[in-house]
Interface confidence: medium
């Protein structure tokens, strides 16, 4: 599924991401925009042999199990395919674990490079939340 901007903002808010670990909803929508272009089925392969999955591009080396990433930790204890569902529950629950891990949203390179320090509230402007 490819979410609309406000549709995703609403879904993320319903799942409790607004101000989760101090990160406003705009940060999460911005991250999803630049990680996956709001596409729940996005997959991208990395040079280390891992793959990033889903709307928040969660990595198979650390967070999920795709059956083929050497040394996978699967810290979210889920199959990576669950992160590709049109229901974002699994991605959100795993993202909550990731953002609680110490580096906050710096874990998402796209957030660090495209969202951090910008007017992230623009990503939820005009949305009925």
């Amino acid at each position: 599924k490819v979410f609309g901007r406000c549709e995703l903002a609403a879904a993320m808010k319903r799942h409790g991401l607004d101000n989760y670990r101090g990160y406003s909803l705009g940060n999460w929508v911005c991250a999803a925009k630049f990680e996956s272009n709001f596409n729940t089925q996005a997959t991208n392969r990395n040079t280390d042999g891992s793959t990033d999955y889903g709307i928040l591009q969660i990595n198979s080396r650390w967070w999920c199990n795709d059956g083929r990433t050497p040394g996978s930790r699967n810290l979210c204890n889920i199959p990576c395919s669950a992160l590709l569902s049109s229901d974002i529950t699994a991605s959100v629950n795993c993202a909550k674990k990731i953002v609680s891990d110490g580096n906050g949203m710096n874990a998402w390179v796209a957030w660090r490079n495209r969202c951090k320090g910008t007017d992230v509230q623009a990503w939820i402007r005009g949305c009925r939340l």
Epitope: Q41, D66, G67, R68, P70, C80, S81, L84
Partner: antibody, heavy 115, light 107 residues
Framework: QVQLQESGAEVMKPGASVKISCKAT????????IEWVKQRPGHGLEWIGE????????YYNEKFKGKATFTADTSSNTAYMQLSSLTSEDSAVYYC?????????WGQGTTLTVS | DIELTQSPATLSVTPGDSVSLSCRAS??????LHWYQQKPHESPRLLIK???QSMSGIPSRFSGSGSGTDFTLSINSVETEDFGMYFC?????????FGGGTKLEIK
């Protein structure tokens, strides 16, 4: 137990297209990548590409882009590879395998003859 | 693409001999190297994954070693059922690639 069952041998004319199937049983089909591998005598094994059935995400070896197209039907736990514009170079045995980085589970192979 | 070169192309041995098959990668692939055996008209069978991890049901005479770019499959005291083709495969990066194979034949 995990099994991959491929469709039977095919004899095709040059220029035609063919669709090979790979039915998976014994595991959650949507969770694992399905890989496709080509084997020609004297040419060893070549990785064609892969599909993740749960999402339809695909990756192709550059060499096979435009030649192979992968699809999957999650209702029947079956992956498909279509090969187009067939030539004699496409005559080979084609395998599906479950993509665990290494390939422990293989189909029995589908022999394609283009003649 | 990562190129895998296997040597020798053919190995003629007598049952009871011990042999080593080589697989060399064109760049470092860490330990992401796997070995397969293939008999005529059969699908490949995974023997060793990630350089040295033996698969269940595979006889203990098969072992793997190496890292980086140089890898070895060793067969301690070859048996008649071991004859066939052996392929290495890397999963360090895409596209996945295979070696050209070593044919193990009876002398």
């Amino acid at each position: 137990q995990v099994q991959l069952q491929e469709s039977g041998a095919e004899v095709m004319k040059p220029g035609a297209s063919v669709k090979i199937s790979c039915k998976a049983t014994g595991y959650t089909f949507t969770t694992y990548w399905i890989e496709w591998v080509k084997q020609r005598p004297g040419h060893g094994l070549e990785w064609i590409g892969e599909i993740l059935p749960g999402s339809g995400s695909t990756y192709y070896n550059e060499k096979f882009k435009g030649k192979a197209t992968f699809t999957a039907d999650t209702s029947s736990n079956t992956a498909y590879m279509q090969l187009s514009s067939l030539t004699s170079e496409d005559s080979a045995v084609y395998y599906c395998a479950r993509g665990d980085g290494n390939y422990y589970y293989w189909g029995q192979g589908t022999t394609l003859t283009v003649s | 693409d990562i190129e895998l070169t296997q040597s020798p192309a053919t190995l003629s041995v007598t049952p009871g001999d011990s042999v080593s098959l080589s697989c060399r990668a064109s760049q470092s692939i860490s330990n992401n190297l796997h070995w397969y055996q293939q008999k005529p008209h059969e699908s490949p069978r995974l023997l060793i994954k990630y350089t040295s991890q033996s698969m269940s049901g595979i006889p203990s005479r098969f072992s793997g070693s190496g890292s980086g770019t140089d890898f070895t499959l060793s067969i301690n005291s070859v048996e008649t059922e071991d004859f066939g083709m052996y392929f290495c495969q890397q999963s360090n990066s895409w596209p996945r690639t295979f070696g050209g194979g070593t044919k193990l034949e009876i002398k």
